[in-house]
């Protein structure tokens, strides 16, 4: 296992539809056909995967159908956007990319991305 | 090395509005936030909100939305704040300072002081 | 919101002696919570984040510690150039808030 350089930005703000998009960014060193990559999520010391997908190089990420993450990739970038997120969901999005094939195995784990989420304000009831 | 240079004291009238602005140089400016702070003289400090310079997006103090806005320029990497309807009670020390990775206020500006006064 | 309460608002203390200063919130925030330093005409200073870790530059006699609603910021040593305004401040969630200060003067 090599060790590989992952940037992400430190915080961003989600939208009031409680949506995130960030970019991962990753300095491969080598040419990877196959590429993982995995949103984990710290909170409290406590880390749980968001999401994961595996793709290969010049193709679309898929998460599986019930994943809230989507994303797209353009070389050693990869534009990820997390969905349905809600003040309680605010904690730090740790972008870990791992260079499958082929060999020799590299991880890198970025710093993380703080996200900070605002439950929308509820809108008042209209009468008709 | 990190810094935050505020733009200039203002004097306004009540009514008014007032734009100041906040350049920041020395790291990646869209990876960080900017928040604005205030402090009314001898009182405490008073967050107004902050914007995400990655994606615009802003959160408000409730007590001052509809007549604040926060924007950047990341081509220049300067964040503005915009308050109107200025009132007496808007004078005060404004300062940004840069949102780090636990929300900390990692660097500050030097502040821009808002005199209103009829 | 969550609202954060200081104790004391002003404290009068001799060099060298110990400074205790607490930090209180309305509901459990974990370790989101900052300490900064003003002195007179000065803008803050970020003195510890998240809850108890030092920054660079800042001198070894400050440190923070608690979590979840209680926290403190001690000051061992005091020294004359503490003489300063202390805030600390929530990130745990949105709005982000102020306590309302802790006056520190020498005597």
């Known amino acids: 296992c090599k060790a590989m350089h992952v940037a992400q930005p430190a915080v961003v703000l989600a939208s009031s539809r409680g949506i995130a998009s960030f970019v991962c960014e990753y300095a491969s060193p080598g040419k990877a056909t196959e590429v993982r990559v995995t949103v984990l999520r710290q909170a409290d010391s406590q880390v749980t995967e968001v999401c994961a997908a595996t793709y290969m190089m010049g193709n679309e990420l898929t998460f599986l159908d019930d994943s809230i993450c989507t994303g797209t990739s353009s070389g050693n970038q990869v534009n990820l956007t997390i969905q349905g997120l809600r003040a309680m969901d605010t904690g730090l999005y740790i972008c870990k990319v791992e260079l499958m094939y082929p060999p020799p195995y590299y991880l890198g784990i970025g710093n993380g991305t703080q996200i900070y989420v605002i439950d929308p304000e509820p809108c008042p009831d209209s009468d008709f | 090395q990190v810094q935050l240079v505020q733009s200039g004291a203002e004097v306004k009238k009540p009514g008014a509005s007032v734009k100041v602005s906040c350049k920041a140089s020395g790291y990646t400016f869209t990876s960080y936030g900017i928040s604005w702070v205030r402090q009314a003289p001898g009182q405490g400090l008073e967050c107004m909100g902050w914007?995400?310079?990655?994606?615009?997006?802003?959160n408000y103090a409730q007590k001052l939305q509809g007549r604040v806005t926060m924007t950047t320029d990341t081509s220049t990497s300067t964040a503005y704040m915009e308050l109107r309807s200025l009132r007496s009670d808007d004078t005060a020390v404004y300062y940004c300072?840069?949102?780090?990775?636990?929300?900390?206020?990692?660097?500050w500006g030097q502040g821009t002081l808002v005199t209103v006064s009829s | 919101e969550i609202v954060l309460t200081q104790s004391p608002d002003f404290q009068s203390v001799t060099p060298k002696e110990k400074v205790t200063i607490t930090c209180r919130a309305s509901q459990s925030i974990g370790s989101s919570l900052h300490w900064y330093q003003q002195k007179p005409d000065q803008s803050p200073k970020l003195l510890i984040k998240?809850?108890?870790q030092s920054i660079s530059g800042v001198p070894s006699r400050f440190s923070g510690s608690g979590s979840g609603t209680d926290f403190t910021l001690t000051i061992n040593s005091l020294e004359a150039e503490d003489a300063a305004a202390y805030y600390c401040h929530q990130s745990s969630s949105l709005p982000f808030t102020f306590g309302p200060g802790t006056k520190v003067d020498i005597k």
């Open positions: 998240y809850a108890s």
């Open positions: 300072a840069r949102v780090g990775r636990f929300g900390e206020f990692d660097y």
């Open positions: 914007i995400s310079a990655y994606n615009g997006n802003t």
